[in-house]
Amino acid sequence: GSVKVLHEPSCFSDYISTSVCQWKMDHPTNCSAELRLSYQLDFMGSENHTCVPENREDSVCVCSMPIDDAVEADVYQLDLWAGQQLLWSGSFQPSKHVKPRTPGNLTVHPNISHTWLLMWTNPYPTENHLHSELTYMVNVSNDNDPEDFKVYNVTYMGPTLRLAASTLKSGASYSARVRAWAQTYNSTWSDWSPSTTWLNYYEPWEQHLGLNDIFEAQKIEWHEHHHHHHHH
């Protein structure tokens, strides 16, 4: 039978090295065997390049295309082929469809004044346009109480968040994850980072424990482990 595209390709760029396109076929398809996505920068002398798609689901294909460090003027011509049959043709401008890279290395450290210091890394090198454009969302949730969660918007430059231990339940296990977006590029949110988990030991002031006692306890109990949360 004839090959048809049900949902045409939707593409996003991390604006540094990779663009990813995803589309849905009208029936289960072996993407890598049956389809090819050709892409070419609209620029004098640019060659045609071919991406071999992979299956994300039975009928969903995804293609990851290496791109050079993107600039605003870049526009790609995309053609989706099933053998000699052209299924879809379109253009894609990475600067208009940015999905930032996922922030990395999320860690939680005990800090002065009964606070936790959450730190992560900006996923872009300083020379990249997006390095100074990112703002973040941090999700902090109680592992044993789905209704005990907080969302923090980090709109300042540094990839850090200070969290008062008193805002969390004492003795509870909490997980944090972070994602990024670039406002000036009207980007989508990045995927969530892997979660970091820690135990919140906070004794109210009236217990009159010294800071050192509290933080010794925190350091003994404090641990972290990583597990992935997928954002759809």
């Epitope: 920068l41 620029f43 004098m44 002398g45 640019s46 060659e47 045609n48 390049h49 290496p66 791109i67 050079d68 600039v71 605003e72 003027a73 870049d74």
Partner: antibody, heavy 125, light 112 residues
Framework: EVQLVESGGDLVKPGGSLRLSCVAS????????MTWVRQAPGKGLQWLSL????????YYADAVKGRFTISRDNAKNTLYLQMNSLRAEDTAVYYC??????????????????WGQGTLVTVSS | DIVMTQTPLSLSVSPGETASISCRSS???????????LDWYMQKPGQSPQGLIY???KRASGVSDRFSGSGSGADFTLKISRVEADDAGVYYC?????????FGQGTKLEIK
């Protein structure tokens, strides 16, 4: 050492044909676009045509479109310019030059960074 | 098509002085910040042209630092400082952004 050696220039009658060759050495020929430029006697430089490294993309000046064909043989490190329906105004020295690096997604540009010595084409009856 | 216009068409400069040539394009040659697709070439009598400057301001390999390019958008300048007798020749600007590529008319530099 990068070298470009053109050949094939000759005296030809109007309406005639000629094929110019440019043999390249000293650089990865297949990775670079190549360009033909000409210069009529006592005149300035005129860009004619460009071909990408794989040969998959070609571009022409309006003055030669439909009459001239640029091609390349990467196995022989050779660039060609097939010239048909020649006219008196095609009389010029023809230069080949190395253009942009096209093996990258966005071609890396260094200008026309090496030129051949040129070959003279004379169109006259 | 992008039209390239050079001024002046001829220039006479004494050794040690600075020569300045202007090149204007009918459309912007800036693809993105730092990427101005404008080159400068020099041609001596009886010789092939040779590249001096590419991307508006980058010197080609082996070119003296007396040659400098500046400008962006549609306005560019080539400056030759401390001019020497060997600098005599015809100077061309060329746009490398889009087909058809195009050269300016050329500026003849004469050393007094």
């Amino acid at each position: 050492e990068v070298q470009l050696v053109e050949s094939g220039g000759d005296l030809v009658k109007p309406g005639g044909s000629l094929r110019l060759s440019c043999v390249a050495s000293g650089f990865p020929f297949r990775d670079y676009a190549m360009t033909w430029v000409r210069q009529a006697p006592g005149k300035g430089l005129q860009w004619l045509s460009l071909i990408s490294g794989s040969g998959g993309k070609t571009y022409y000046a309006d003055a030669v479109k439909g009459r001239f064909t640029i091609s390349r043989d990467n196995a022989k490190n050779t660039l060609y310019l097939q010239m048909n329906s020649l006219r008196a105004e095609d009389t010029a020295v023809y230069y080949c030059a190395v253009d942009r690096l096209t093996k990258t997604i966005r071609p890396q540009y260094y200008g026309l960074w090496h030129w051949g010595q040129g070959t003279l084409v004379t169109v006259s009856s | 098509d992008i039209v390239m216009t050079q001024t002046p068409l001829s220039l006479s400069v004494s050794p040690g002085e600075t020569a300045s040539i202007s090149c204007r394009s009918s459309q912007s040659l800036t693809y993105s910040i730092g990427y101005n697709y404008l080159d400068w070439y020099m041609q001596k009598p009886g010789q092939s042209p040779q590249g001096l400057i590419y991307l508006g301001s980058k010197r080609a390999s082996g070119v003296s630092d007396r040659f400098s390019g500046s400008g962006s958008g549609a306005d560019f300048t080539l400056k030759i400082s401390r001019v020497e007798a060997d600098d005599a020749g015809v100077y061309y600007c060329m746009q490398g952004l889009q087909s058809p590529l195009g050269f300016g008319q050329g500026t003849k530099l004469e050393i007094k």
